[in-house]
């Protein structure tokens, strides 16, 4: 996990200022309001399970 301002997060992840670490973009399907989802250049999340 990288500190902000250094190397970017690995492919498929994005920096979360709230959690102070890289987070999986895949989790934006479940939690689209997460701060790091703004940095995820994926297609709009599919409808979630609940």
């Amino acid at each position: 996990e990288q500190a902000p301002g250094t190397a970017p997060c690995s492919r498929g992840s994005s920096w979360s200022a709230d959690l102070d670490k890289c987070m999986d973009c895949a989790s934006c399907r479940a939690r689209p309001a997460s701060d790091f989802c703004l940095g995820c250049a994926a297609a709009p999340p599919a409808p979630f399970r609940l």
Epitope: D18, L19, D20, D24, R29, A43, L50
Partner: antibody
Framework: QVQLQQSGGGLVQPGGSMKLSCIAS????????MSWVRQSPEKGLEWVAE??????????HYAESVKGKFTISRDDSKSRFFLQMNNLRAEDTGIYYC??????????WGQGTDLTVSS | DIVMTQTPASLAVSLGQRATISCRAS??????????MHWYQQKPGQPPKLLIK???SLESGVPARFSGSGSGTDFTLNIHPVEEDDTATYYC?????????FGGGTKLEIK
């Protein structure tokens, strides 16, 4: 480092109650969803219940087999969460694990605590 | 509920060879971008440990000998080359919907 420390468990008679606790440290507890997962030789690993974060209105979800019997709750101010189990039956016997997830996979796990329901 | 079927139930692999474990979901657990399938390793007396998330993403600290693949309903965990320390039971789990369900496990023995 991340730790999930469990307490509770033991021997309880059929129809009895038990409360399990899990205290978290080393991560931003309030942002994570918390679950209980149990394991038995008969049913393997079985997700039991989940409580989401404040931003998700502390929504709770339960496996069909425990709906109306088990209640999951959390106390973000003390980084702990609980499983209240009522009307216990023999099929509830197993090892109970607390676990955290941001959304999908079970990242951190407690050490497990044994529950035996028997007369 | 989505049923997760793991095969084989057990296998014995020689040291340094490849172990392949399969997991089939009763319905698709993938979008066009991600697969909501995860793999765990469990040793006796310990809780499960996350190995692979989202079908193919290696968890931090897990050796590159472990790899995952698949999409839709069919997924595979590969371990190559296997080491003595890999003796354990391996489980798949989906997070497509509630209830989250696990496979029945595959017990790996190193010969």
């Amino acid at each position: 480092q991340v730790q999930l420390q469990q307490s509770g468990g033991g021997l309880v008679q059929p129809g009895g109650s038990m409360k399990l606790s899990c205290i978290a440290s080393g991560f931003t507890f309030s942002s994570y969803w918390m679950s209980w997962v149990r394991q038995s030789p008969e049913k393997g690993l079985e997700w039991v219940a989940e409580i989401r974060s404040k931003s998700d209105n502390y929504a709770t979800h339960y496996a069909e087999s425990v709906k109306g019997k088990f209640t999951i709750s959390r106390d973000d101010s003390k980084s702990r969460f609980f499983l209240q189990m009522n009307n216990l039956r023999a099929e509830d016997t197993g090892i109970y694990y607390c676990s955290s997830t941001y959304a999908d996979y079970f990242h951190y796990w407690g050490q497990g605590t044994d529950l035996t329901v028997s007369s | 509920d989505i049923v997760m079927t793991q095969t084989p139930a057990s296998l014995a692999v020689s040291l340094g060879q490849r172990a392949t474990i399969s997991c089939r979901a009763s319905q698709s657990v993938s979008t066009s971008t991600y697969s909501y399938m995860h793999w765990y390793q469990q040793k006796p007396g310990q809780p499960p440990k996350l190995l692979i998330k989202y079908a193919s993403s290696l968890e931090s600290g897990v050796p590159a000998r472990f790899s995952g693949s698949g999409s839709g309903t069919d997924f595979t965990l590969n371990i190559h080359p296997v080491e003595e320390d890999d003796t354990a039971t391996y489980y798949c789990q989906h997070s497509w919907e509630i209830p989250y369900t696990f496979g029945g496990g595959t017990k790996l023995e190193i010969k």
